[in-house]
Every structure is written in structure tokens, then in C-alpha cells.
């Protein structure tokens, strides 16, 4: 039975050219996290494997930095980075937990961070 929940940074916004941290946290479970995948729509951004560490996809290697923790830092943001991002926690024995973050990249300096919320 899957008892865990994923807490994410929720809906966030950032300025074009800036950077943003995508963060998820898995709680309320004793399951072992074997791997965390970060994806944008159907594109793989990065993987953090419990045994092998961080792996950044080739197409994002110049703009994505691992961390902090199991989070992901996106750099040199463009308007095209606007969209949904998913943290996918692969755990044993529970299975897979997925969290969603919506990022809006703004042209001007009106960007501000959204509230945190939970996805069961």
C-alpha cells in the first residue's frame, strides 16, 4: 500500500535569464528511494540514482545543475521553459510517486514564488 505523499514547490515563476530550483519531497513512507527522475512533459531532464548518483540528459547538460538534495536547478531560463515539470520518485517497495510543478518564465521582473502544496 502506498502511504507516501509528495510535497512540491507548486506553481512558481521566474525571470527570463535567471534560474530556479525545482524541489520535491517525499514524506509519510518508509519506502527506499531508488531513483528520482526529473521530466518536462515527455522529456527526461535528469536522474538521481541512489547507487550511481546524478545523470543530466545531454540536451540539458549546459543549463541544468543537480541539487540541492534531490531537487534540480534550471539556469539561463527562457520563455520556452514555461510548462509542467515532474519529479518521479521510484521507491521500493511502494512503487512510483509523482509530483507536479508548473513553472512560468516571465519577461519582466514581476516573478514571484507560489505557495507549496501537496500531491498525494
Amino acid at each position: 500500500m502506498m502511504t507516501g505523499t509528495i510535497e512540491t514547490t507548486g506553481n512558481i515563476s521566474a525571470e527570463k535569464g535567471g534560474s530556479i530550483i525545482l524541489q520535491c519531497h517525499l514524506s509519510s513512507t518508509t519506502a527506499q528511494v531508488t531513483q528520482v527522475n526529473w521530466e518536462q512533459q515527455d522529456q527526461l531532464l535528469a536522474i538521481c540514482n541512489a547507487d550511481l548518483g546524478w545523470h543530466i540528459s545531454p540536451s540539458f547538460k549546459d543549463r541544468v545543475a543537480p541539487g540541492p538534495g534531490l531537487g534540480l536547478t534550471l539556469q539561463s531560463l527562457t520563455v520556452n521553459d514555461t510548462g509542467e515539470y515532474f519529479c518521479i520518485y521510484h521507491t521500493y517497495p511502494d512503487g512510483t510517486y509523482t509530483g507536479r510543478i508548473f513553472l512560468e518564465v516571465l519577461e519582466s521582473s514581476v516573478a514571484e514564488h507560489g505557495a507549496r502544496f501537496q500531491i498525494p
Epitope: 547507487d51 545531454p58 521500493y92
Partner: antibody
Framework: QVQLQESGPGLVKPSQTLSLTCTAS??????????WGWIRQPPGKGLEWIGS???????YYNPSLKSRVTISVDTSKNQFSLKLSSVTAADTAVYYC???????????????WGQGTMVTVSS | EIVLTQSPGTLSLSPGERATLSCRAS???????LAWYQQKPGQAPRLLIY???SRATGIPDRFSGSGSGTDFTLTISRLEPEDFAVYYC??????????FGGGTKVEIK
């Protein structure tokens, strides 16, 4: 679909270094999801994993061979290579390169293989 | 390391018969990390099954995998002439390192 092809000397002298290269065609080894591995098979025996490498150069090795093994990658040539030092007759085997799905989790396996190349260690 | 013991070493059967191959691990293996391969003489191994029970692309449905923990099975429901080969199981953990079983030869009776 990626295809893999091993190349290198078929004969190596004892105490020397065995060097093999695997060239990928039909696809790039710059993949976010896959490592690229080496497996060997002595004549008439079973399979032994040697080690694997990610496009960025991250590696993981079989501990029993780690002290003698170096695996490297050259993304500009779409190749990865194996070096095995201080070889003996026991290293005589068919050497295969393969795509390693270790990051694919529920699909962990070697799903694409080269045809293999026979390497004999003899003086 | 995790030792995979395959049995029997050799299986003598006729075309059309059912083949049941066993792979036993020295310690528990996640079913997600268990694969089966077929190897014919002079050829590279070919992936048949990953995740203990999922068929790889292009593999006929007469091949099926099952099991969990320390006991895994590859079943060939009706042997075709091209199925006579050596079969290997493999576990794909990182720590302890990945290993292959010693193989089962399926030969024509």
C-alpha cells in the same frame, strides 16, 4: 535502432593491455537514460559483466576486475572503449559491448548487443 | 555478490514440448532487475525478458517469465526448432554488482 560493433586486436600478449573499442551507429551514445557496457565470455563458459559507462564519463565496474579495468567514452566519435591491463590466459574470451539500461529501472537489462570479438591472450 | 544458480544445466526436450527453466538467487532480487537472455552458438545473447516477466520487443509470446524474491522461472510454452539454445538469467543490481547465471542449455532430445 542503435547498432554496436566491437573492434580491436584479436591477439594480446600476457602482461600487456587489452584494448577494444565499441562504435555505435544508427543512434547516439549521448543518451540520458542509458549506460554502455562491456561483457565477456570465455570459450565454452558463461557471461561476465566487466563494467559500464555513461556519456558523461560516469562509470561503474565489476569489483573483481575494477583494479585492471578502464572504460572511457568519446562522444565525438560515438564510441566507448575498454582497457584491461596485466592480462593472462584467463582473460581469453569473446568480448561484447552492449547498451546498459541500469537507469531504466523496471527495464534494467542489456537490450542491444554487438556481435562480439574474440580476444586471445597468448605469447 | 549475488550468485544466480540455473537449473537444470541441460534440458533435453522435443519440439512442441514445454520448457521450464529455473534461476535461483543467493539473496533476494527485485523482480524489476531480473532479465533472461537467449544465446545461440556463435551469436551474441539476445534479450528475451526484462523485469522478470515483460517480453522484450519482438519476442514471441511463447516465452514467459515469472517469479520474485529468490526464485525466477523462464517458460517456453511450445518449443520451436529455433528455440534450442543456451539461456541465461541476469540480475541488474549495482551494489552488489550485476551478475549472470551459469546458463541452461536446451537441446533437442
Amino acid at each position: 535502432q542503435v547498432q554496436l560493433q566491437e573492434s580491436g586486436p584479436g591477439l594480446v600478449k600476457p602482461s600487456q593491455t587489452l584494448s577494444l573499442t565499441c562504435t555505435a551507429s544508427g543512434g547516439s551514445i549521448e543518451s540520458g537514460l542509458y549506460y554502455w557496457g562491456w561483457i565477456r565470455q570465455p570459450p565454452g563458459k558463461g557471461l561476465e559483466w566487466i563494467g559500464s559507462i555513461y556519456y558523461s564519463g560516469s562509470t561503474y565496474y565489476n569489483p573483481s576486475l575494477k583494479s585492471r579495468v578502464t572504460i572511457s567514452v568519446d562522444t565525438s566519435k560515438n564510441q566507448f572503449s575498454l582497457k584491461l591491463s596485466s592480462v593472462t590466459a584467463a582473460d581469453t574470451a569473446v568480448y561484447y559491448c552492449a547498451r546498459d539500461g541500469v537507469l531504466a529501472l523496471n527495464k534494467r537489462s542489456f537490450d542491444i548487443w554487438g556481435q562480439g570479438t574474440m580476444v586471445t591472450v597468448s605469447s | 555478490e549475488i550468485v544466480l544458480t540455473q537449473s537444470p544445466g541441460t534440458l533435453s526436450l522435443s519440439p512442441g514440448e514445454r520448457a521450464t527453466l529455473s534461476c535461483r538467487a543467493s539473496q533476494s532480487v527485485s523482480s524489476s532487475y531480473l532479465a533472461w537472455y537467449q544465446q545461440k552458438p556463435g551469436q551474441a545473447p539476445r534479450l528475451l525478458i526484462y523485469g522478470a516477466s515483460s517480453r522484450a520487443t519482438g519476442i514471441p509470446d511463447r516465452f514467459s517469465g515469472s517469479g520474485s524474491g529468490t526464485d525466477f522461472t523462464l517458460t517456453i510454452s511450445r518449443l520451436e526448432p529455433e528455440d534450442f539454445a543456451v539461456y541465461y538469467c541476469q540480475q541488474h543490481t549495482v551494489r552488489p554488482p550485476l551478475t549472470f547465471g551459469g546458463g541452461t542449455k536446451v537441446e533437442i532430445k
